[in-house]
């Protein structure tokens, strides 16, 4: 009696179970009563990443330099190429089809997390006691200068964008 289901890594065709092609290979011809499934390795710049019955391998992803992309990991016959963005840019999506410029943290904000090829800069407001006077994709909030440790006094209070200004203590004559 012909099977209605096949084992793992097999597929049903013409009332019989044939072996699927292994990753990195494509189907050339289905098995018969007398022959095994015929598979062929994927060509250069092609891949198949699952046990399959595909007659064509997939093309490796192209990391288009015109879009700021570069190869992070070269593809094999079993894996696709992984693209990432050039320095200063990050992917616009998980598939990394294009890039976008990293965010800079404005004055009053510091970098909480530096951007990577796949994620944007994360900024945070400088809390009391800290400041940032630059727009930067790297600078954290800096602590206000401690005037006391320099034997000086605060002449001008700090803000989230400016450091305190220290000055000499008034000397009693």
């Amino acid at each position: 009696e012909p099977p209605t289901a096949c084992r793992e890594k097999q597929y049903l065709i013409n009332s019989q179970c044939c072996s699927l092609c292994q990753p990195g290979q494509k189907l050339v011809s289905d098995c018969t009563e007398f022959t095994e499934t015929e598979c062929l390795p994927c060509g250069e710049s092609e891949f198949l990443d699952t046990w399959n019955r595909e007659t064509h391998c997939h093309q490796h992803k192209y990391c288009d330099p015109n879009l700021g992309l570069r190869v992070q990991q070269k593809g094999t016959s079993e894996t696709d190429t992984i693209c990432t963005c050039e320095e200063g840019w990050h992917c616009t999506s998980e598939a990394c089809e294009s890039c976008v410029l990293h965010r800079s943290c404005s004055p009053g904000f510091g970098v909480k997390q530096i951007a990577t090829g796949v994620s944007d800069t994360i900024c945070e407001p400088c809390p009391v006691g800290f400041f940032s006077n630059v727009s930067s994709a790297f600078e954290k909030c800096h602590p206000w200068t401690s005037c006391e440790t320099k034997d000086l006094v605060v002449q001008q209070a700090g803000t989230n964008k400016t450091d305190v200004v220290c000055g000499p203590q008034d000397r009693l004559r």
């Epitope: 700021g68 840019w89 294009s98 976008v100 410029l101 944007d120």
Partner: antibody, heavy 118, light 111 residues
Framework: QSLEESGGRLVTPGTPLTLTCTAS????????MSWVRQAPGKGLEWIGT??????ASYASWVNGRFTISKTSSTTVDLKITGPTTEDTATYFC??????????????WGPGTLVTVSS | DVVMTQTPASVSGAVGGTVTIKCQAS??????LAWYQQKPGQPPKLLFY???NLASGVPSRFSGSRSGTEFTLTISDLECADAATYYC?????????????FGGGTEVVVK
């Protein structure tokens, strides 16, 4: 699909003003929406953009004077706090959000004129 | 901060002639550049994206190219309807702290 800006009028310096951009034929949920202005006889000046997750980014010259917010799936507001005569311009709303060219503006409103004068 | 510098501020050409507009990016923006056409009293209209991809409905008399950080818009077989101001725009600034993604504009006068 279209966009229309409203709320432009003559205001005195320092009077807060809110402009509204209304979408027809689509919802703004999956798009980045931007405000761009143009002073009389001058070039285009980007003000800011609101993402589909409602986070906004602004031009470095804005300094907190403008606030963009999504008020519904079809409206985006631009609030101008303390306008000066320098803010006299036609204000355009533009739709971006193509997957590859993320800030490409393929749909614009006709613009609304804001005049700041005492 | 990426800055887009457009030249010239104004250019004129005869009907049937050719004009060229340039846009220089202050750093590498790859092919993330668009060109727009704006006529008085109207919003800008998208002409090109990706430096050289023609937007739908735009005649092939318009062409765009890139060489490093310099981008060029060429209008050939000039028509009276081409009289307008043209702007370049950096299209992938995302949430970066940019002053403006637009160039200053170039007015095209058709004689």
């Amino acid at each position: 699909q279209s966009l229309e800006e409203s709320g432009g009028r003559l205001v005195t310096p320092g009077t807060p003003l809110t402009l509204t951009c209304t979408a027809s034929g689509f919802t703004m949920n999956r798009y980045r929406m931007s405000w761009v202005r143009q002073a009389p006889g001058k070039g285009l000046e980007w003000i800011g953009t609101i993402n589909n997750d409602a986070g906004a980014s602004y031009a470095s010259w804005v300094n907190g004077r403008f606030t963009i917010s999504k008020t519904s799936s079809t409206t985006v507001d631009l609030k101008i706090t303390g306008p000066t005569t320098e803010d006299t311009a036609t204000y355009f709303c533009a739709r971006a959000g193509d997957n590859i060219y993320v800030d490409l503006y393929n749909l614009w409103g006709p613009g609304t004129l804001v005049t700041v004068s005492s | 901060d990426v800055v887009m510098t457009q030249t010239p501020a104004s250019v004129s050409g005869a009907v049937g002639g050719t004009v060229t507009i340039k846009c220089q990016a202050s750093e590498n923006i790859f092919s993330y550049l668009a060109w727009y056409q704006q006529k008085p009293g109207q919003p800008p209209k998208l002409l090109f994206y990706g430096a050289s991809n023609l937007a739908s409905g735009v005649p092939s008399r318009f062409s765009g190219s890139r060489s490093g950080t310099e981008f060029t818009l060429t209008i050939s077989d000039l028509e009276c309807a081409d009289a307008a101001t043209y702007y370049c725009q950096f299209t992938n600034y995302g949430s970066s702290d940019i002053r403006s993604p637009f160039g200053g504009g170039t007015e095209v006068v058709v004689k």
